[in-house]
């Protein structure tokens, strides 16, 4: 069966949108009006993972691009990256662990916890125009809460 996917955009809890910053990086900034068209559209795939009653495993690809958010160690630190994949083989139901995020819904907000690195979350900075990154703290300065907007296929 083809993996179930939906198209969506994400905004952090301060309403910053996510846009491409170079070929392999995302950044978060406030967009308005026609600039909203710059925000990345994700293809969120529902995949196998350590699913629980509170966590749904997903993979986050960039729509119509062979790029997926993935979590790897760089200089001994969990790091978020955009990784290029073979479009013939992705998305798939059984994604490698580095591509999997646990989608957690709390009070109408979403968190995306790395399956590879528990308690590390997709994060944005308070500051404008900064890279989206993998952060190891919740409830601090950095933002780990997002809202999701559905996009028609």
């Amino acid at each position: 069966a083809p993996v179930r996917s939906l198209n969506c955009t994400l905004r952090d809890s301060q309403q910053k949108s996510l846009v491409m910053s170079g070929p392999y990086e995302l950044k978060a900034l406030h967009l308005q009006g026609q600039d909203m068209e710059q925000q990345v559209v994700f293809s969120m795939s529902f995949v196998q993972g350590e699913e629980s009653n509170d966590k749904i495993p997903v993979a986050l690809g960039l729509k119509e691009k062979n790029l997926y958010l993935s979590c790897v160690l760089k200089d001994d630190k969990p790091t978020l990256q955009l990784e290029s994949v073979d479009p013939k083989n992705y998305p798939k139901k059984k994604m490698e662990k580095r591509f999997v995020f646990n989608k957690i819904e709390i009070n109408n907000k979403l968190e995306f916890e790395s399956a590879q690195f528990p308690n590390w979350y997709i994060s944005t900075s308070q500051a404008e125009n900064m890279p989206v990154f993998l952060g190891g703290t919740k409830g601090g300065q950095d933002i780990t809460d997002f809202t999701m907007q559905f996009v028609s296929s």
Epitope: A1, Q48, G49, E50, E51, S52, N53, D54, K55, K93, K94, M95, E96, K97, V100, P118
Partner: antibody
Framework: EVQLQESGPGLVKPSETLSLTCTVS????????VSWIRQPPGKGLEWIGL???????YYNSPLKSRLTISKDNSKSQVSLKLSSVTAADTAVYYC????????????????WGQGTLVTVSS | DIQMTQSPSSLSASVGDRVTITCQAS??????LNWYQQKPGKAPKLLIS???TLPPGVPSRFSGSGSGTDFTFTISSLQPEDFATYYC?????????FGQGTKLEIK
């Protein structure tokens, strides 16, 4: 060698809480999930739920409101608690190890304990 | 939840016979289908995973095939120790669900 062993009281009174322990060896509970499955006498198998290596749980809907699965990694033990039991909860209860092979086979249960019969009766 | 329909519910056969059991899923589960053998008073034992893969130590007379919704489990030549109850299990998504079981008896 992977081994799982269930233990607990064989008789529980209606409305009380059924408590079982699964003691494992040959693998670490931090690395592998453990499921609970039950089988009423002469009937088929029903998957109850599981606890993952990181401690997250998934409970099957029909039992969700009455079920708690927890673990103690240092003791290599997983526990199951089922509250407000009735005669319908009489069954052999099994624990089983998840295969946990990411990108290949996460959800298959590859090793099982021998099971323990729990009878709910006054 | 995914429903697993297993048939037949019981089966009589003789040593040396070829035996086939089928399992049908209510939705497409790719190849995430396992087969277990259970003898009276014993725990289920994994015989086949991912529709057709035999774990180490499982005799080659056991085989499985299928994908999507329709799956088959075959014992090519029944041995005396094969008389038991067999269950399919879908491991595609939670909650995991079993077939009703097939009791294989001596004719």
């Amino acid at each position: 060698e992977v081994q799982l062993q269930e233990s607990g009281p064989g008789l529980v009174k209606p409305s009380e809480t059924l408590s079982l322990t699964c003691t494992v060896s040959g693998f670490s509970l931090t690395d592998y999930g453990v499921s609970w499955i039950r089988q009423p006498p002469g009937k088929g198998l029903e998957w109850i739920g599981l606890i993952w290596g990181g401690g997250d749980t998934y409970y099957n809907s029909p039992l969700k409101s009455r079920l708690t699965i927890s673990k103690d990694n240092s003791k290599s033990q997983v526990s199951l608690k089922l509250s407000s039991v009735t005669a319908a909860d009489t069954a052999v209860y099994y624990c089983a190890k998840q295969r946990n092979l990411w990108g290949y086979d996460l959800y298959t249960m590859d090793y099982w304990g021998q099971g323990t019969l729990v009878t709910v009766s006054s | 939840d995914i429903q697993m329909t297993q048939s037949p519910s019981s089966l009589s056969a003789s040593v040396g016979d070829r035996v086939t059991i089928t399992c049908q899923a209510s939705t497409d589960i790719d190849e995430d289908l396992n087969w277990y053998q259970q003898k009276p008073g014993k725990a289920p034992k994994l015989l086949i995973s991912l529709a057709s893969t035999l774990p180490p130590g499982v005799p080659s007379r056991f085989s499985g095939s299928g994908s999507g919704t329709d799956f088959t489990f075959t014992i090519s030549s029944l041995q005396p120790e094969d008389f038991a109850t067999y269950y399919c299990l879908q491991s595609d998504r939670f909650p995991l669900t079993f077939g009703q079981g097939t009791k294989l008896e001596i004719k």
